[in-house]
């Protein structure tokens, strides 16, 4: 089961994913893949991090624009198209056997609404899509008995479960973000 997020064609999509490094700065590898989380690793990797930084991106449209070093590994997909729709896997690769946290999020890309641009556009869109759309309880795609956990206390912060509607205001936020 996965949480759904909506973005308009041409805008930026934001797929939240985070963990709490413990102690601060003790980062773990993360991968984002197109497709639901598989048993191992990520399928169709779009972005991968190591213990220090992003080290693999399949396209310049994929970014981690949050504070990566504090565990915000939310994925931004720039200038989305209908082809970007689908399930994405965020996998937080906690050391140890079967300790990974796996989170499936679904991106729904819609065509821009044919409305006259107005200051109330974002409010109107938000009222049309009041909260998040979910297909069930979010969290790990499967429950597994973890092995002995290392010194990484993972508290996945329920992934900012608001439905994200992207309009031009997001572009302003993105333009001021630090690109890592």
């Amino acid at each position: 089961s996965e949480v759904e997020y909506i973005a308009e064609v041409g805008q930026n999509a934001y797929l939240p994913c985070s963990y709490t490094p413990a102690p601060p700065g003790n980062l773990v590898p993360v991968c984002w893949g197109k497709g639901a989380c598989p048993v191992f690793d990520c399928s169709n990797v779009v972005l991968r991090t190591d213990n220090r930084d992003v080290n693999d991106r399949t396209s310049g449209r994929y970014w981690l624009k949050g504070d990566f070093h504090k565990g915000d590994v939310s994925l931004t997909i720039e200038n989305v198209t209908l082809a970007d729709s689908g399930v994405y896997c965020c996998r937080i690769q906690i050391p140890g056997i079967m300790n990974d946290e796996k989170h499936n999020v679904k991106l729904v890309v819609i065509k821009p609404a044919k409305v006259t641009p107005a200051p109330t556009l974002q409010r109107d869109l938000t009222s049309a899509f009041p909260r998040m759309l979910t297909t069930g309880e979010h969290g790990p795609a499967e429950t597994q008995t973890p092995g002995s956990l290392p010194d990484v206390n993972l508290t996945v912060s329920n992934f900012f479960c608001e439905l994200q509607i992207f309009t031009l205001t997001n572009e302003l936020r993105d333009s001021g973000a630090t690109i890592r």
């Epitope: 598989p38 048993v39 795609a141 499967e142």
Partner: antibody
């Protein structure tokens, strides 16, 4: 051409040991997950174990945990499966394969027969 | 563990015909499904992964579809070399599991 060639199979008595080898060529072996899959006579394929290259994480199906050990030697581009305390139900053709979730390509297989 | 059930167990067809093989998962595996072909005395060969993506070098007559629990492998026009054993495999849930196979034989 990507190629995997297994060796080391044979006849062994219950409780005995065998070490299977898989020689890889045609790709950068050290960057890929590698997997062992087996097929008992008349039975479906069964995933046995795999190893994450670099990180070294190793995963096993429950029925072989504590008895089988998967390993690699990147200098030799080789994958291994050390099989101890073998049982009759371990009789199968053992394949090595490249990949973590789906497998491509596969070796030709080596037959392991556990019988007294 | 996830049980993968393939049907039919045996499919008798003639060259040039369209073959449809089915695979059902005991619970949703999303699109995390692969198909393999195996000929007697040979290793399995990957045909499809991600439910519908053809592996490198696989002819266009092979196509995969489905999501969740129901999947299909279609061979649009059977060639003599297509008569073999076909397996599906899920890779969403631990452990990875395979179907029991469908034997495609010449009628």
């Amino acid at each position: 051409e990507v190629q995997l060639v297994e060796s080391g199979g044979g006849l062994v008595q219950p409780g005995g040991s065998l070490r299977l080898s898989c020689a890889a060529s045609g790709f950068t072996f050290s960057t890929y997950w590698m997997t062992w899959v087996r097929q008992a006579p008349g039975k479906r394929l069964e995933w046995v174990a795999n190893i994450k290259q670099g990180g070294g994480d190793k995963y096993y199906v429950d029925s072989v945990k504590g008895r089988f050990t998967i390993s690699t030697d990147n200098a030799k581009n080789s994958l291994y499966l050390q099989m101890n305390s073998l049982r009759a139900e371990d009789t199968a053709v053992y394949y090595c394969a490249r990949g973590s979730n789906w497998f491509d390509p596969w070796g030709q297989g080596t037959l392991v027969t556990v019988s007294s | 563990e996830i049980v993968m059930t393939q049907s039919p167990a045996t499919l008798s067809m003639s060259p040039g015909e369209r073959a449809t093989l089915s695979c059902r998962a005991s619970q949703s595996v999303y699109d995390n499904l692969a198909w393999y072909q195996q000929k007697p005395g040979q290793a399995p060969r990957l045909l499809i992964y991600g439910a519908s993506t053809r592996a490198t070098g696989i002819p266009a007559r092979f196509s995969g579809s489905g999501s969740g629990t129901e999947f299909t492998l279609t061979i649009s026009s059977l060639q003599s070399e297509d008569f073999a054993l076909y397996y599906c495999q899920q890779y969403t849930h631990w452990p990875i599991t395979f179907g029991q196979g469908t034997r495609l034989e010449i009628k």
